[in-house]
């Protein structure tokens, strides 16, 4: 997260880290005791999933292996459309005050809605600085029409934009797959942005979760 702040401890109990060994690979969101939602471009053969801590690499955090993941069948590496994936945990999460599932959206929030994005991604770009603490940024949803003025053909129909005018605050490498939460519901998953990160007036781009609720529910049901 560029130009963000340290999240209030315990305020994001659904936030998970997908680790490759001990290294951060992506963010993710707990949606069920067996399931984590993340970005399709975060796909690996297997994952170590850290839950229940704001500190990356916290020894006291829950760590669960995951060997199965289900990318959206329409995901494109070229256009990043349908950048959404479900990761099935090998064993169920122990729910607590520190580990909770996020609320999936009942509706799509409108432009102008205030939201918070979080992650352990680099806080500087192009030179990288990875924080140990979970970082947050407060952003507002931007209409597709406004966002298309910036990204034109790069912006797909199920992509959601968020940012703050003239501000550098944005997501960056390592934040991918993490949550954009608006009014206590999951509205976005970090998908992409421009590189180097933090270009003013280049919104962050997210997978619009409200458009995928049926796919999420059906995939979890099929592979339970």
């Amino acid at each position: 997260i560029i130009d963000g702040y340290k999240c209030k401890e315990g305020s994001h109990p659904w936030q998970v880290a997908l680790l490759k060994g001990n290294q951060l690979h992506c963010g993710g969101v707990l949606v069920d005791k067996y399931w984590v939602l993340t970005a399709a471009h975060c796909k690996m053969g297997q994952y170590q999933v850290q839950l229940g801590s704001d500190k990356i690499g916290d020894q006291s955090a829950q760590k669960i292996k995951a060997t199965k993941s289900f990318r959206h069948p329409g995901y494109s590496t070229k256009t990043h459309v349908n950048d959404i994936m479900l990761v099935r945990l090998d064993e169920p999460v122990k729910m607590s005050s520190k580990v909770e599932a996020v609320q999936l959206p009942e509706h799509c929030e409108p432009p102008g809605t205030s939201c918070t994005v979080s992650g352990w991604g680099t806080t500087t770009s192009p030179d990288v600085t990875f924080p140990s603490d979970l970082m947050c940024s407060d952003v507002k949803l931007i209409s597709s029409r406004e966002c298309k003025k910036v990204y034109k053909d790069l912006l797909g129909k199920t992509m959601l934009c968020a940012g703050i005018p003239d501000s550098k605050t944005n997501t960056c490498n390592g934040d991918s797959g993490g949550p954009l939460v608006c009014n206590d519901t999951l509205q976005g998953l970090v998908s992409w942005g421009t590189y180097p990160c933090g270009q003013p007036n280049d919104p962050g781009v997210y997978t619009q979760v409200c458009k995928y609720k049926r796919w999420v529910m059906e995939t979890m049901k099929t592979h339970r």
């Epitope: 471009h41 590496t77 990043h80 192009p126 910036v150 990204y151 034109k152 053909d153 790069l154 997501t171 960056c172 490498n173 991918s176 998908s191 992409w192 942005g193 421009t194 590189y195 180097p196 990160c197 270009q199 003013p200 007036n201 280049d202």
Partner: antibody, heavy 122, light 107 residues
Amino acid sequence: QVQLQESGPGLVKPSQTLSLTCTVSGGSISSGGYYWHWIRQHPGKGLEWIGYIYRSGYTYYNPSLKSRVTISVDTSKNQFSLKLSSVTAADTAVYYCARAKQLTTSRYFDYWGQGTLVTVSS
Amino acid sequence: DIQMTQSPSSLSASVGDRVTITCQASQDIANYLNWYQQKPGKAPKLLIYDASNLETGVPSRFSGSGSGTDFTFTISSLQPEDIATYYCQQASDLPFTFGGGTKVEIK
């Protein structure tokens, strides 16, 4: 279809400034996510990245050339330019302009100009 | 700067042969690795992006693999039109850097 076309003098005298312009057609230089680069290739050798400019005017130069390079953009003409000062014979090369899709998830040069040979000689 | 070491610098193979080129990065670049083909007197052309993704319109005999520091580019069945120099390029960190190139010739 995006096209890039380099233009400028093919011969520059030592100690002078090399100036090249790249004209972009079929796409807007103001589009977010696309950066505009200069790359050169010495005769019979490999590719050397010089630097880029973004729609906002944000630039980044190769540290090895930074003190001599300036890249600028003219969005109204859909052009970007390279200036390389205090040239020597070692700057003789084919100069390419290129577009890069440059996202957090994916970055690559997808369109290139055909290249222009610049010879530094008195 | 990240150094990209490409090998071999040149190779000669027969039509129909499988050709493999390797590229090693001096540090972890994840999958930010691209492959380009350059024919004499022409600009480089993108073949593979993000280590393993085939650019639109590029024949399927070209492929790429790898992650981290070690990458491979393969032509499954060499064709006469594949005579060119091939370059790897890292896009993980600035400045972007290229490998030294591999000149592919027909025996």
